[in-house]
Interface confidence: low
Amino acid sequence: NQDLPVIKCVLINHKNNDSSVGKSSSYPMVSESPEDLGCALRPQSAGTVYEAATVEVDVSASITLQVLVDTPGNISCLWVFKHSSLNCQPHFDVQNRGVVSMVILKMTETQAGEYLLFIQSEATNYTIVFTVSIRNTLLFTLRRPYFRKMENQDALVCISESVPEPIVEWVLCDSQGESCKEESPAVVKKEEKVLHELFGTDIRCCARNELGRECTRLFTIDLNQTPQTTLPQLFLKVGEPLWIRCKAVHVNHGFGLTWELENKALEEGSYFEMSTYSTNRTMIRILFAFVSSVARNDTGYYTCSSSKHPSQSALVTIVEKGFINATNSSEDYEIDQYEEFCFSVRFKAYPQIRCTWTFSRKAFPCEQKALDDGYSVSKFCNHKHQPGEYIFHAENGDAQFTKMFTLNIRRKPQVLAEASASQASCSSDGYPLPSWTWKKCSDKSPNCTEDIPEGVWNRKANRKVFGQWVSSSTLNMSEAMKGFLVKCCAYNSLGTSCETILLNSPGPFPFIQDS
């Protein structure tokens, strides 16, 4: 049809730099060259409908959808997204083509969907359909590894159903506690799926691919170790495999191990035993309890008993869905400028969380440490005494958790002053928030001690800069004050700071720092 306009649909991918957040479409961002989206007429549709290629976008990416229309005369347009109409302002480029743009900043799930652009020209009306989806990260997965018994062998297979296929490694350690940290010389790594040496103190399996690294520890009760003050607890989701290892060492082979669930012996086929002699001729026995796919009724106290050691138990809890338990109430802290201080979040979670600490839109790495009582803790000490709002965010695939912290640094006020033709303003970020006084300097009061009682407007905490409160005070100028020096002072329990301003002088205002 010769009436149909020549249309080009393009995608512009913006390289995000933080300053672009929330800015209007005219704000400059670093861009890739435009990508042709090959707008084609949609067959058998009522009216003239063009369809662009689907655009798949990374979470937090910023893009522009753009239509270039080669049609004579003016055009008017309307964007529609999820039944809401959005403003549309066409303009013309140097080739006199109509240009219509839709900017999507910091792509989120809520911005995914169909964007309809209705264009009306002098010749015809038509619709352009853009489909924007979040990048399908389901194609990339990294799942926590789990264990299976190798058929007809006393060995464990480590499995991680991940894409791309992960590299699987066993991480073994024969020491206790801190010395089993990843880079410790006591740690041995074996890049293989099957493990035959199952007598070690600490056994973990890790899987890694482009998405990162996930590990699972073989849950162990050691009858030769003093039991923890709180009962060890193991969480699993319905359908996951259960593996618990009971380990005991004795001077000779004359002892046996048994597993019980709530005082009932485990069924045949739910356990297997291995034994070996150690270098000092003592006997090591291990007894595995396993369930290939747990159900709710597998919940309970699993007790490992020995004829020569005190028995020990662990509580296995089967949940339908993962969880993160922690108090999410926000916490405010007030510290001195050189005081050592760390934020801390104590939580219980299953599966293990991934977490970040955020301040001023910058994310910081998050470390977590397991405590003896089944809880974990994450601390953040790298605040560099910057006041403001700090956010702890955790997720584990099933649950999300966010906690806010506010850090206030006790310090005397520092005053910044500015003036316009009609008013003078002072602001300060000291803490506790300062109070203000204004003084007039004159022949009668060369030390600027004369109070200005009227025209002062104080705004406490008027703007929050990443959680940092700022207090300001404004003096509205009367004709009588013009040409005078005035002094604004901010004071709190830690001290006072002043700034002197010349009202209504020609040219830029000189600020005289008053010590």
Epitope: P34, E35, V57, L139
Partner: nanobody, 125 residues
Amino acid sequence: EVQLLESGGGLVQPGGSLTLSCAASGRTFSSYAMGWFRQAPGKEREFVAAISWSGSNTYYADSVKGRFTISRDNSKNTLYLQMNSLRAEDTAVYYCAAGGSTRVVVTTTPVVKYWGQGTLVTVSS
């Protein structure tokens, strides 16, 4: 289903050049973002370069910027990697990769749906 077959690897001296090709079977080659990854001995697989479905956008790892050029010929169902100023640290198995099936993937590390078998590039004097 897309099958990818790399070729062009071999032994080359430091400072030399090499062009890798990746032939794709299947009629949907032009609808995929394509990329090259590499894996050096004892190291993890790493992103090298990627190209959008139409070829108008290219992405590179910092370590190869200015030395490697990725391109594609949709009419021949072929992806290329022109490697200049090769260094010993470029020694690796190079894998061709096809991204998600949508026609535009806005990312510097495409979601990989299909992998080739790899071709070995050795840079040594």
